[in-house]
Structure formats: C-alpha cells, structure tokens
C-alpha cells in the first residue's frame, strides 16, 4: 500500500489550472507567473468498505498546505469547501471520512472526482473561466467535470 | 434528539439464533457509522464489529467473524445483530452505538440502552 | 491481540483533578490509536466523551480532556463533580479492530 500522498497537477480541458485565492480554488487559464496549486491525493486504506464500482476513493489537498477538499450542505445544497486538515490524518483514521473522500474515475486522460459523501455529486469548474470550483450534478454544457490530472514524480 | 433504541431482553436455548434490533431516532443512520459492542458480567467491552448502512459493507473482530452478521434497514433506519450457534459464552449485554465524524475526529458518541441476551437451556 | 489496561478503581473528591490512563501492551499509545473514552453510569448509560486522543464532541464538558501523558492515553477530569461517579473505559484503535480497557471505576467522594 502507498501510505505518503502523490502529488499531481490539474487542469480541465480548456486548459485551465486550479489557484488558491483567498482560501477558495478558482480555475483560470494559465498564465505567466501564476502558480497552479499542487494537488496532494492518496487513497483510502479503507477502500474494501466503499462501493467498488465508481472509482477508486481518495482524499483530495493542496500539497504542502494542510488544506484538503471536502463536501458539506448548506442548507440542501452539497457544496465544496477547502479545510484545514492534515491528508494523512484523514488517511490514518479508523473510518473513511466520506465528507473528505471522492471516487476518482480516469477514462483516457480524463479524470472525474465523484464525492463519496453525496453520490452524483461531482467537482466542477463552470465553463467561465475564473469562477470557484463546484459540486454539481449537472454533467451538461454549463459545468465542466472533465480534468486532467498529471501526477508528479 | 439523537437516540438509540435496543429490543427488550433475551432468553434463547443454546445452539439458536438471535437477532437484536437497534432502531435509530433524531438521525439518518446512512449518515453515520453503526458499531455494536458486547459486555460481559463483570468483563470490560469487545467491539464485534461495524456496517455502513449506507452500502451495508460490514467489518469484524476476527474472533466474531462467523459468529455475528450485522445488517441494516435504512427505510426504518435500524440496525441488526445476528448471533448464530449459541453457547452460554454469548451470555452478555449488546450495545450498539453510532461512531461519528464531527470535523475532527470519529466519536462513539450515543449509545444504545443495551440488550440483555442469556443463553440457557 | 492486543491488551489494553486501565486502572481498576480510583478515588477522588470534589473539585479535584483525576487523571485515569489507558496502557497498550504492543508499545506507547500514540495519534494512530485515535483513543475514545466513554463513561458508563448504572442502568447501562453509555456517552461518548473524547475521540481522537483529545477531541471533545458537542455537548460534553470541558472538564472532560484527552491527552498522551508518556506512553499511555489519558482523561483528565478537572475540577471532578459528583455526578463524575461512575466506569470509565477507554478504547484503542490497532488499525483494522477496536480493543476496549477493562474500565476505571471512579468514585468521587463527598
């Protein structure tokens, strides 16, 4: 089992990276100067408790920044949040935290993070660029759900 | 409020089965996990095992594999613990319990009232 | 498996601080054990008071702390009420099952 997160980086198909401004991940298009944040991901140890068929379950952060992705409603609605939060904490626990846990689904060199916690409710940037990322469960034009993701060695 | 209700006592003859029931109230057990806990007289608690009743997989204490099933009944938010092949060594309390995230760590934080299984012929 | 020991009994008085502990027998209780404690009162009363080795849950009191003090886990009651009477057990997690203490009965005096 790999237990020390892998880092990678993340753009969507219109070439958009993810920036932290002001504790949110907005994507924008890539410039000069700007620098993308690099995510940090690791799989649940747990995942023989998760459903198999969706993809495999990880923990989502921004590498090097104790600040992992996670799922919340406010109100009725499943919204995405940066907290504070140590990756291999959440690793490490007894349970899967299904509010910090996403299925990550590759086909070709695409890659999709459903959240564990609300099925059907996937990361999104909308088709706007600099605008915060999303849950959503409109796989439509609006949104897109489609990323890249590079791992680096 | 959060509560959980445990069925009423048990006296079963040895080599029966049992199922105990530990129906939920002021929460959805999806949301949660749901971990049951054996107390024997004047012995300390042994965790038997966990279900997710959101997709109903299960984890045991090696010593219960074969021994409990735990199953879960989401539309009336209730939980389940089978005993098979009783011997007066199950003779016990059962307890279930809800094992909850908070943001910051997992918590066996309500707990049922207990159910009082004697095996005796 | 692992065996996990608390103290039997202790005794304390009103407003005084008890610290009971909670010993591994595979090495030091560290982070990864993610100690719980519950209190038992009569009548079967279970209530979860620590997670995660120091977290508290809403709605228990802040007398109530968690801490590693050496190689053991530990609960902390400062400033003990009467209403404090009763078992305590503490429990350990060793990566693929939960392993319970034999529970400490405090008695508070008074």
């Known amino acids: 089992k790999i237990d020390t997160p892998q880092r990678g980086s993340i753009q969507d198909i219109n070439h958009r990276v993810w920036v932290l401004q002001d504790q949110t991940l907005i994507a924008v298009p890539r410039k000069d100067r700007m620098s993308p944040v690099t995510i940090a991901l690791i799989s649940c140890r747990h995942v023989e408790t998760l459903e198999k068929d969706r993809g495999n379950p990880i923990y989502l952060g921004l590498n090097g920044l104790n600040l992992c992705l996670m799922c919340a409603k406010v109100g009725d609605q499943p919204t995405l949040q940066l907290k504070e939060k140590d990756i291999m904490d959440l690793y490490n626990q007894p349970e899967p935290v299904k509010s910090f846990l996403f299925y990550h689904s590759q086909s070709g060199r695409n890659s999709t993070f459903e959240s564990v916690a609300f099925p059907g409710w996937f990361i999104a940037v909308s088709s706007e660029g600099g605008c915060p990322l999303i849950l959503t469960q409109e796989l439509g034009k609006a949104n897109t759900t489609d990323f890249g993701l590079t791992m680096l060695f | 409020e959060v509560q959980l209700q445990q069925s009423g006592a048990e006296l079963v003859k040895p080599g029966a089965s049992v199922k105990l029931t530990c129906t939920a109230s002021?929460?959805?057990?999806?949301?949660?996990?749901i971990y049951w806990v054996k107390q024997r007289p004047a012995q300390g608690l042994e965790w038997i095992g966990r279900i997710d009743p959101a997709n109903a997989y299960t984890k045991f204490d090696p010593k219960f594999q074969g021994k409990a099933t735990l199953t879960a009944d989401t539309s009336s938010n209730t939980a389940y613990l089978q005993l098979s092949s009783l011997t007066s060594e199950d003779t016990a309390v059962y307890y279930c319990?809800?094992?909850?995230?908070?943001?910051?760590?997992?918590?066996?934080?309500?707990w049922g009232q207990g159910t009082t299984l004697t095996v005796s012929s | 498996q692992a065996v996990v020991t608390q103290e039997s009994a202790l005794t304390t008085s009103p407003g005084e601080t008890v610290t009971l502990t909670c010993r591994s027998s595979?090495?030091?209780?560290?982070?990864?054990?993610?100690a719980n404690w519950v209190q038992e009162k009569p009548d079967h009363l279970f209530t979860g008071l620590i997670g995660g080795t120091d977290n508290r849950p809403p709605g228990v009191p802040a007398r109530f702390s968690g801490s590693l003090i050496g190689d053991k886990a530990a609960l902390t009651i400062t400033g003990a009420q009467t209403e404090d009477e009763a078992i305590y057990f503490c429990a350990l997690w060793y990566s693929n099952l939960w392993v319970f203490g034999g529970g400490t009965k405090l008695t508070v005096l008074g």
């Open positions: 319990t809800r094992f909850h995230w908070y943001g910051s760590s997992f918590f066996f934080d309500y």
């Open positions: 595979t090495g030091a209780v560290t982070t990864s054990n993610y």
């Open positions: 002021g929460f959805n057990i999806k949301d949660t996990y």
